[in-house]
Protein backbone atom coordinates (compact mmCIF):
# COMPACT_ATOMS: atom_id res chain seq x y z
CA UNK A 1 0.00 0.00 0.00
CA UNK A 2 1.30 3.49 -0.77
CA UNK A 3 2.55 5.59 2.11
CA UNK A 4 0.64 8.79 2.84
CA UNK A 5 2.56 12.02 2.32
CA UNK A 6 1.95 15.75 2.61
CA UNK A 7 3.90 18.60 1.03
CA UNK A 8 5.22 21.26 3.37
CA UNK A 9 7.92 23.79 4.04
CA UNK A 10 9.78 24.17 7.34
CA UNK A 11 11.11 27.27 9.03
CA UNK A 12 13.16 27.31 12.19
CA UNK A 13 11.95 29.18 15.26
CA UNK A 14 13.88 32.26 14.13
CA UNK A 15 11.88 32.14 10.87
CA UNK A 16 14.85 31.04 8.77
CA UNK A 17 13.86 29.09 5.67
CA UNK A 18 15.63 26.01 4.35
CA UNK A 19 17.18 26.08 0.88
CA UNK A 20 19.47 23.83 -1.15
CA UNK A 21 23.17 24.49 -0.81
CA UNK A 22 24.82 22.39 -3.47
CA UNK A 23 23.37 19.03 -4.50
CA UNK A 24 23.42 17.28 -1.10
CA UNK A 25 23.15 19.95 1.59
CA UNK A 26 20.53 22.26 3.06
CA UNK A 27 21.22 25.63 4.64
CA UNK A 28 19.04 27.97 6.71
CA UNK A 29 18.65 31.66 6.02
CA UNK A 30 16.08 34.43 6.18
CA UNK A 31 14.14 34.85 2.97
CA UNK A 32 11.62 37.47 1.94
CA UNK A 33 9.30 38.17 -0.96
CA UNK A 34 10.05 36.35 -4.19
CA UNK A 35 13.12 34.73 -2.66
CA UNK A 36 10.72 32.54 -0.64
CA UNK A 37 10.36 30.47 -3.80
CA UNK A 38 13.89 29.18 -3.18
CA UNK A 39 12.86 27.30 -0.05
CA UNK A 40 12.75 23.53 -0.35
CA UNK A 41 9.41 21.78 -0.34
CA UNK A 42 9.43 18.58 1.67
CA UNK A 43 7.25 15.57 1.16
CA UNK A 44 6.58 14.43 4.72
CA UNK A 45 5.67 10.74 4.69
CA UNK A 46 3.96 9.02 7.60
CA UNK A 47 5.86 5.79 8.04
CA UNK A 48 6.07 2.87 10.41
CA UNK A 49 8.14 3.33 13.54
CA UNK A 50 8.43 2.45 17.18
CA UNK A 51 5.36 3.19 19.31
CA UNK A 52 5.67 6.24 21.51
CA UNK A 53 3.14 8.56 23.11
CA UNK A 54 4.11 11.88 21.65
CA UNK A 55 6.26 10.90 18.66
CA UNK A 56 5.07 10.40 15.10
CA UNK A 57 7.51 8.64 12.75
CA UNK A 58 8.02 10.50 9.48
CA UNK A 59 10.42 10.56 6.56
CA UNK A 60 11.41 13.85 4.95
CA UNK A 61 11.94 13.72 1.21
CA UNK A 62 12.48 16.63 -1.12
CA UNK A 63 9.40 17.01 -3.29
CA UNK A 64 9.83 15.54 -6.77
CA UNK A 65 13.47 14.72 -6.06
CA UNK A 66 14.75 11.30 -5.12
CA UNK A 67 16.49 12.75 -2.07
CA UNK A 68 15.72 12.03 1.58
CA UNK A 69 17.16 13.37 4.79
CA UNK A 70 19.00 10.54 6.50
CA UNK A 71 21.13 10.07 9.60
CA UNK A 72 24.41 8.17 9.44
CA UNK A 73 27.63 7.91 11.39
CA UNK A 74 30.48 9.90 9.87
CA UNK A 75 33.78 9.84 11.74
CA UNK A 76 31.87 8.30 14.67
CA UNK A 77 29.44 11.23 14.82
CA UNK A 78 25.72 11.15 13.95
CA UNK A 79 25.42 13.24 10.81
CA UNK A 80 22.55 14.56 8.70
CA UNK A 81 22.80 14.04 4.98
CA UNK A 82 20.68 14.14 1.84
CA UNK A 83 20.68 10.65 0.41
CA UNK A 84 19.71 9.69 -3.12
CA UNK A 85 17.26 6.78 -3.44
CA UNK A 86 15.64 4.76 -6.20
CA UNK A 87 12.38 6.61 -6.93
CA UNK A 88 10.72 3.31 -7.89
CA UNK A 89 11.02 2.10 -4.29
CA UNK A 90 10.54 5.27 -2.26
CA UNK A 91 8.75 6.48 -0.30
CA UNK A 92 7.50 3.33 1.42
CA UNK A 93 5.79 2.53 4.68
CA UNK A 94 8.73 0.66 6.15
CA UNK A 95 11.54 3.11 5.58
CA UNK A 96 15.03 2.16 6.74
CA UNK A 97 15.70 3.58 10.18
CA UNK A 98 18.25 6.12 8.98
CA UNK A 99 15.46 7.89 7.07
CA UNK A 100 13.02 7.99 10.00
CA UNK A 101 12.53 11.00 12.26
CA UNK A 102 10.27 11.14 15.29
CA UNK A 103 8.15 14.24 14.85
CA UNK A 104 7.46 15.78 18.24
CA UNK A 105 4.84 18.51 18.13
CA UNK A 106 3.90 20.85 20.95
CA UNK A 107 1.79 23.96 20.29
CA UNK A 108 2.53 23.86 16.55
CA UNK A 109 6.28 23.76 17.19
CA UNK A 110 7.94 20.72 15.66
CA UNK A 111 11.12 18.88 16.53
CA UNK A 112 12.56 16.08 14.44
CA UNK A 113 14.48 13.51 16.43
CA UNK A 114 16.53 10.93 14.59
CA UNK A 115 15.06 7.44 15.08
CA UNK A 116 18.53 6.00 14.46
CA UNK A 117 20.21 8.28 17.01
CA UNK A 118 17.84 9.14 19.90
CA UNK A 119 18.26 12.65 21.33
CA UNK A 120 19.84 13.92 18.12
CA UNK A 121 17.70 16.49 16.30
CA UNK A 122 17.55 18.27 12.99
CA UNK A 123 19.12 21.59 13.87
CA UNK A 124 20.06 24.98 12.51
CA UNK A 125 22.64 27.49 13.70
CA UNK A 126 21.84 30.94 15.04
CA UNK A 127 24.04 32.30 12.27
CA UNK A 128 22.73 32.97 8.79
CA UNK A 129 23.47 30.78 5.77
CA UNK A 130 24.82 27.81 7.73
CA UNK A 131 24.16 24.12 6.99
CA UNK A 132 21.24 22.27 8.49
CA UNK A 133 22.75 19.55 10.68
CA UNK A 134 22.08 16.85 13.25
CA UNK A 135 22.63 18.24 16.74
CA UNK A 136 22.95 16.40 20.02
CA UNK A 137 21.71 19.18 22.28
CA UNK A 138 18.31 20.73 22.80
CA UNK A 139 17.69 24.11 24.38
CA UNK A 140 21.21 25.35 23.77
CA UNK A 141 22.53 27.78 21.17
CA UNK A 142 21.43 25.70 18.21
CA UNK A 143 17.82 25.73 17.05
CA UNK A 144 15.78 22.51 17.06
CA UNK A 145 12.24 23.96 16.84
CA UNK A 146 10.49 24.39 13.51
CA UNK A 147 7.14 25.49 12.19
CA UNK A 148 5.49 23.79 9.26
CA UNK A 149 3.55 25.36 6.41
CA UNK A 150 1.41 23.22 4.11
CA UNK A 151 2.00 23.44 0.38
CA UNK A 152 -0.65 22.53 -2.17
CA UNK A 153 0.03 19.21 -3.87
Amino acid sequence: APVRSLNCTLRDSQQKSLVMSGPYELKALHLQGQDMEQQVVFSMSFVQGEESNDKIPVALGLKEKNLYLSCVLKDDKPTLQLESVDPKNYPKKKMEKRFVFNKIEINNKLEFESAQFPNWYISTSQAENMPVFLGGTKGGQDITDFTMQFVSS
Partner: antibody, heavy 120, light 107 residues
Protein backbone atom coordinates in the same frame (compact mmCIF):
# COMPACT_ATOMS: atom_id res chain seq x y z
CA UNK B 1 -14.13 24.22 22.69
CA UNK B 2 -13.98 22.17 19.50
CA UNK B 3 -17.25 22.09 17.59
CA UNK B 4 -18.34 20.78 14.22
CA UNK B 5 -21.81 22.08 13.37
CA UNK B 6 -23.58 20.61 10.35
CA UNK B 7 -26.36 21.96 8.18
CA UNK B 8 -29.94 20.84 8.65
CA UNK B 9 -31.88 17.87 7.32
CA UNK B 10 -32.67 17.70 3.60
CA UNK B 11 -35.27 15.91 1.51
CA UNK B 12 -34.19 15.37 -2.09
CA UNK B 13 -35.58 13.83 -5.27
CA UNK B 14 -33.78 10.94 -6.98
CA UNK B 15 -31.27 12.23 -9.54
CA UNK B 16 -30.72 15.53 -7.72
CA UNK B 17 -27.75 16.67 -5.61
CA UNK B 18 -27.30 17.59 -1.96
CA UNK B 19 -24.61 19.76 -0.38
CA UNK B 20 -23.98 19.32 3.35
CA UNK B 21 -21.89 21.83 5.28
CA UNK B 22 -19.73 21.39 8.37
CA UNK B 23 -18.65 24.56 10.20
CA UNK B 24 -15.63 24.12 12.46
CA UNK B 25 -14.71 26.22 15.46
CA UNK B 26 -12.42 26.05 18.47
CA UNK B 27 -9.30 24.83 16.65
CA UNK B 28 -6.97 25.59 13.73
CA UNK B 29 -9.06 24.53 10.74
CA UNK B 30 -6.05 24.27 8.38
CA UNK B 31 -4.31 21.51 10.29
CA UNK B 32 -7.03 18.90 10.54
CA UNK B 33 -8.54 16.63 7.94
CA UNK B 34 -12.29 16.89 7.67
CA UNK B 35 -13.69 13.41 7.19
CA UNK B 36 -17.10 12.56 5.73
CA UNK B 37 -18.87 9.41 6.91
CA UNK B 38 -22.41 8.24 6.30
CA UNK B 39 -24.76 5.84 8.04
CA UNK B 40 -27.85 4.43 6.34
CA UNK B 41 -30.83 3.70 8.63
CA UNK B 42 -30.03 0.78 10.92
CA UNK B 43 -26.69 0.23 9.18
CA UNK B 44 -23.01 0.67 9.95
CA UNK B 45 -20.63 3.52 9.13
CA UNK B 46 -19.12 4.14 5.69
CA UNK B 47 -16.21 6.48 4.92
CA UNK B 48 -16.73 8.76 1.91
CA UNK B 49 -13.66 10.97 1.75
CA UNK B 50 -11.55 13.66 3.38
CA UNK B 51 -10.00 17.06 2.81
CA UNK B 52 -7.07 18.80 4.49
CA UNK B 53 -7.93 22.51 4.25
CA UNK B 54 -4.35 23.68 4.80
CA UNK B 55 -3.02 21.92 1.73
CA UNK B 56 -6.12 21.23 -0.31
CA UNK B 57 -5.31 17.50 -0.36
CA UNK B 58 -8.44 15.42 -0.97
CA UNK B 59 -8.94 11.66 -0.87
CA UNK B 60 -12.12 9.91 -1.93
CA UNK B 61 -13.55 6.46 -1.44
CA UNK B 62 -13.51 5.03 -4.98
CA UNK B 63 -17.07 3.83 -4.41
CA UNK B 64 -18.25 7.45 -4.51
CA UNK B 65 -15.77 8.87 -7.02
CA UNK B 66 -17.49 10.94 -9.65
CA UNK B 67 -20.55 11.46 -7.43
CA UNK B 68 -19.00 13.10 -4.39
CA UNK B 69 -17.16 16.44 -4.23
CA UNK B 70 -15.50 17.61 -1.03
CA UNK B 71 -14.43 21.23 -0.66
CA UNK B 72 -13.38 23.59 2.11
CA UNK B 73 -13.58 27.34 2.61
CA UNK B 74 -10.75 28.44 4.89
CA UNK B 75 -12.19 31.94 5.28
CA UNK B 76 -15.26 30.56 7.04
CA UNK B 77 -13.71 27.34 8.45
CA UNK B 78 -16.41 25.37 6.67
CA UNK B 79 -16.15 22.10 4.77
CA UNK B 80 -18.70 20.86 2.27
CA UNK B 81 -19.68 17.48 0.89
CA UNK B 82 -21.79 17.41 -2.27
CA UNK B 83 -23.32 14.14 -3.45
CA UNK B 84 -24.90 14.04 -6.90
CA UNK B 85 -27.12 11.63 -8.84
CA UNK B 86 -28.93 10.75 -5.64
CA UNK B 87 -30.78 7.48 -5.32
CA UNK B 88 -32.92 6.02 -2.57
CA UNK B 89 -29.99 4.07 -1.12
CA UNK B 90 -28.23 7.39 -0.40
CA UNK B 91 -30.81 8.03 2.34
CA UNK B 92 -28.57 8.27 5.41
CA UNK B 93 -27.21 10.43 8.18
CA UNK B 94 -24.08 12.18 6.91
CA UNK B 95 -21.43 13.04 9.48
CA UNK B 96 -18.31 15.15 9.37
CA UNK B 97 -15.44 14.45 11.75
CA UNK B 98 -11.93 15.79 12.13
CA UNK B 99 -8.51 14.11 12.25
CA UNK B 100 -5.11 15.75 12.81
CA UNK B 101 -2.98 16.08 9.69
CA UNK B 102 -0.55 13.41 10.94
CA UNK B 103 -3.37 10.93 11.66
CA UNK B 104 -2.29 10.70 15.28
CA UNK B 105 -5.58 10.92 17.16
CA UNK B 106 -8.01 9.36 14.73
CA UNK B 107 -11.49 10.84 14.21
CA UNK B 108 -11.63 12.65 17.53
CA UNK B 109 -14.58 15.07 17.16
CA UNK B 110 -17.77 14.58 15.15
CA UNK B 111 -20.56 16.79 13.88
CA UNK B 112 -24.11 16.11 14.99
CA UNK B 113 -25.05 14.55 11.66
CA UNK B 114 -27.30 15.62 8.78
CA UNK B 115 -30.18 13.41 7.71
CA UNK B 116 -30.57 13.29 3.94
CA UNK B 117 -33.73 11.59 2.70
CA UNK B 118 -33.97 10.68 -0.97
CA UNK B 119 -37.56 10.11 -1.98
CA UNK B 120 -39.72 10.72 -5.00
CA UNK C 1 -9.22 -2.82 -0.13
CA UNK C 2 -8.43 -4.05 3.37
CA UNK C 3 -10.89 -6.75 4.43
CA UNK C 4 -12.00 -6.71 8.05
CA UNK C 5 -14.15 -8.66 10.46
CA UNK C 6 -15.54 -7.28 13.70
CA UNK C 7 -16.89 -9.81 16.17
CA UNK C 8 -19.23 -10.55 17.72
CA UNK C 9 -21.95 -8.62 15.88
CA UNK C 10 -23.94 -8.50 19.13
CA UNK C 11 -23.62 -9.69 22.68
CA UNK C 12 -25.71 -9.71 25.84
CA UNK C 13 -23.99 -8.89 29.11
CA UNK C 14 -24.72 -7.79 32.62
CA UNK C 15 -23.50 -4.79 34.58
CA UNK C 16 -20.06 -5.65 35.97
CA UNK C 17 -19.20 -8.11 33.19
CA UNK C 18 -15.93 -8.01 31.28
CA UNK C 19 -16.61 -7.53 27.58
CA UNK C 20 -14.20 -8.11 24.69
CA UNK C 21 -14.73 -7.04 21.07
CA UNK C 22 -12.28 -7.88 18.29
CA UNK C 23 -11.42 -6.52 14.86
CA UNK C 24 -9.33 -8.59 12.46
CA UNK C 25 -7.83 -7.25 9.25
CA UNK C 26 -6.56 -8.87 6.07
CA UNK C 27 -3.22 -7.02 6.36
CA UNK C 28 -1.07 -5.08 8.80
CA UNK C 29 -2.64 -1.70 9.62
CA UNK C 30 0.24 -0.40 11.76
CA UNK C 31 -1.08 1.96 14.47
CA UNK C 32 -4.00 3.46 12.59
CA UNK C 33 -6.96 2.06 14.51
CA UNK C 34 -9.67 3.83 16.51
CA UNK C 35 -12.59 2.47 18.54
CA UNK C 36 -15.92 4.33 18.74
CA UNK C 37 -19.07 4.07 20.80
CA UNK C 38 -22.41 5.04 19.28
CA UNK C 39 -25.77 5.36 20.96
CA UNK C 40 -29.07 5.46 19.03
CA UNK C 41 -29.66 8.78 17.27
CA UNK C 42 -26.23 10.13 18.28
CA UNK C 43 -22.93 10.70 16.51
CA UNK C 44 -20.12 8.24 17.21
CA UNK C 45 -17.84 9.08 20.12
CA UNK C 46 -14.13 8.29 20.03
CA UNK C 47 -12.91 6.04 22.87
CA UNK C 48 -9.47 4.75 21.88
CA UNK C 49 -7.04 6.00 19.25
CA UNK C 50 -3.74 4.65 17.93
CA UNK C 51 -4.79 1.16 19.07
CA UNK C 52 -4.45 1.69 22.81
CA UNK C 53 -4.51 5.36 23.74
CA UNK C 54 -7.47 6.45 25.80
CA UNK C 55 -9.25 9.61 24.68
CA UNK C 56 -9.34 12.30 27.38
CA UNK C 57 -12.41 11.90 29.59
CA UNK C 58 -13.06 8.27 28.66
CA UNK C 59 -13.24 6.00 31.74
CA UNK C 60 -10.25 3.72 32.34
CA UNK C 61 -12.46 0.62 32.21
CA UNK C 62 -12.08 0.93 28.42
CA UNK C 63 -8.81 -0.34 26.99
CA UNK C 64 -7.42 -1.24 23.59
CA UNK C 65 -4.74 -3.70 22.58
CA UNK C 66 -3.32 -5.54 19.60
CA UNK C 67 -0.95 -5.01 16.70
CA UNK C 68 -0.58 -5.89 13.06
CA UNK C 69 -3.89 -7.45 12.06
CA UNK C 70 -5.68 -8.33 15.34
CA UNK C 71 -7.09 -5.74 17.74
CA UNK C 72 -9.27 -5.83 20.83
CA UNK C 73 -11.46 -3.42 22.75
CA UNK C 74 -12.05 -4.46 26.36
CA UNK C 75 -14.54 -3.05 28.85
CA UNK C 76 -13.30 -4.35 32.18
CA UNK C 77 -16.52 -3.84 34.15
CA UNK C 78 -19.58 -2.99 32.10
CA UNK C 79 -21.60 -0.02 33.36
CA UNK C 80 -25.24 0.86 32.52
CA UNK C 81 -24.12 3.73 30.26
CA UNK C 82 -21.93 1.37 28.21
CA UNK C 83 -24.84 -0.34 26.48
CA UNK C 84 -24.33 0.86 22.91
CA UNK C 85 -22.88 -0.15 19.57
CA UNK C 86 -19.10 -0.22 19.18
CA UNK C 87 -17.14 0.20 15.94
CA UNK C 88 -13.51 0.01 14.97
CA UNK C 89 -12.03 1.85 12.00
CA UNK C 90 -8.75 1.40 10.15
CA UNK C 91 -7.30 4.55 8.60
CA UNK C 92 -4.03 3.05 7.43
CA UNK C 93 -5.10 2.67 3.81
CA UNK C 94 -7.77 4.01 1.49
CA UNK C 95 -10.63 3.50 1.62
CA UNK C 96 -10.79 3.82 5.39
CA UNK C 97 -13.08 1.05 6.62
CA UNK C 98 -15.28 0.60 9.67
CA UNK C 99 -16.05 -2.71 11.30
CA UNK C 100 -19.64 -3.88 11.07
CA UNK C 101 -20.30 -2.93 14.68
CA UNK C 102 -20.95 -4.81 17.91
CA UNK C 103 -24.21 -4.12 19.70
CA UNK C 104 -23.81 -4.57 23.47
CA UNK C 105 -27.21 -5.29 25.00
CA UNK C 106 -28.43 -5.86 28.53
CA UNK C 107 -28.79 -9.53 29.45
Amino acid sequence: QVQLVQSGAEVKKPGSSVKVSCKASGYTFDRYWIEWVRQAPGQGLEWMGEILPGSGDINYNEKFKGRVTITADKSTSTAYMELSSLRSEDTAVYYCARMYYDYDQGFDYWGQGTLVTVSS
Amino acid sequence: DIQMTQSPSSLSASVGDRVTITCKFSQDIDRFLTWFQQKPGKAPKSLIYRVKRLVDGVPSRFSGSGSGTDFTLTISSLQPEDFATYYCIQYDEFPYTFGGGTKVEIK
